[in-house]
């Protein structure tokens, strides 16, 4: 069952989404999973105490990018 | 770094089957969405279909269920199994992997060659 | 399925020159949250296709500052503000929101005058 709305996180985050901490937001099923599911690391909150982990092929935001592009969980759509 | 090296294309007459590999080091397949593209001699880019995380797959639906795409996660390969290959199919083969949090394939095979021909 | 529109399928320019390069979606390219997953790749013959721009605007790491998207809802542009002689290639515009499937452009190639 879909969980309830949770809150606003960042630019990439209009709608509320509704991954609970330990899940992130799948766009191509839509729907949240568990994030290890997942190939590319989802960028921390806003306050996280720690960069977000980043592989060789996740690229920093160089062009048009603004603080919380990306936060985790990723939104549902709602 | 994440690397995908392709084999098994080739020569194959028209109406046959064709087996294609792609093995992946440096990431493992049951995380994220991993892509069969192609692109005929000349011609621009096509997604043929992806296998994802738990082995659900999907397909570009103008191949009319000929193709097929599975895996081998103790081997950490993943395959794409042509049938009813006719001469539009020829064309480099290219496995690739899915960014899922920006959805553009960051990591690409080198892509083998399959010619349908008699 | 979206179909992807590039212009011009081909043209010849200069090093030094200012490459345009425009591509434009059969419907609009907005997700429902917000973003616009439309990217371009570039690639060479005989080598696999190489990601150059993401979400419109966003260069891929390592990818020189030459290179800028630009765009919203369904038009779109590449430019290279200063043509150099490895970027002589085939560039493809891709479309992500709407998938699957994914789609692609038919490419521009960009040659020599």
């Known amino acids: 069952m879909r969980r309830g709305p949770r809150s606003l996180r960042g630019r990439d985050a209009p709608a509320p989404t509704p991954c609970v901490p330990a899940e992130c937001f799948d766009l191509l099923v839509r729907h949240c999973v568990a994030c290890g599911l997942l190939r590319t690391p989802r960028p921390k909150p806003a306050g996280a105490s720690s960069p977000a982990p980043r592989t060789a092929l996740q690229p920093q935001e160089s062009v048009g990018a603004g603080a919380g592009e990306a936060a985790l969980p990723l939104p549902g759509l709602l | 770094e994440v690397q995908l090296v392709e084999s098994g294309g080739g020569l194959v007459q028209p109406g046959g089957s064709l087996r294609l590999s792609c093995a992946a080091s440096g990431d493992s397949i049951t995380s994220g969405y991993w892509n069969w593209v192609r692109q005929a001699p000349g011609k621009g880019l096509e997604w043929v279909g992806y296998i994802s995380y738990s082995g659900s797959t999907y397909y570009n639906p103008s191949l009319k269920s000929r193709f097929t795409i599975s895996r081998d996660t103790s081997k950490n390969t993943f395959y794409l199994q042509m049938n009813s290959l006719r001469a539009e199919d020829t064309a480099v083969y290219y496995c690739?992997?899915?960014?899922?949090?920006?959805?553009?394939?960051?990591?690409w095979g080198q892509g083998t060659l399959v010619t349908v021909s008699s | 399925d979206i179909q992807m529109t590039q212009s011009p399928s081909s043209l010849s320019a200069s090093v030094g020159d200012r490459v345009t390069i425009t591509c434009r979606s059969s419907q609009s390219l907005v997700h429902s949250n917000g973003n616009t997953y439309l990217h371009w790749y570039q690639q060479k013959p005989g080598k696999a296709p190489k990601l150059l721009i993401y979400?419109?605007?966003n260069r891929f790491s390592g990818v020189p500052s030459r290179f800028s998207g630009s765009g919203s809802g369904t038009d779109f542009t590449l430019t290279i503000s200063s043509l150099q002689p490895e970027d002589f290639a085939t560039y493809y515009c891709s479309q992500s929101t709407h998938v699957p499937p994914f789609t692609f452009g038919q490419g521009t190639k960009v040659e020599i005058k």
């Open positions: 979400k419109v605007s």
């Open positions: 690739a992997g899915l960014n899922d949090l920006y959805l553009y394939f960051d990591v």
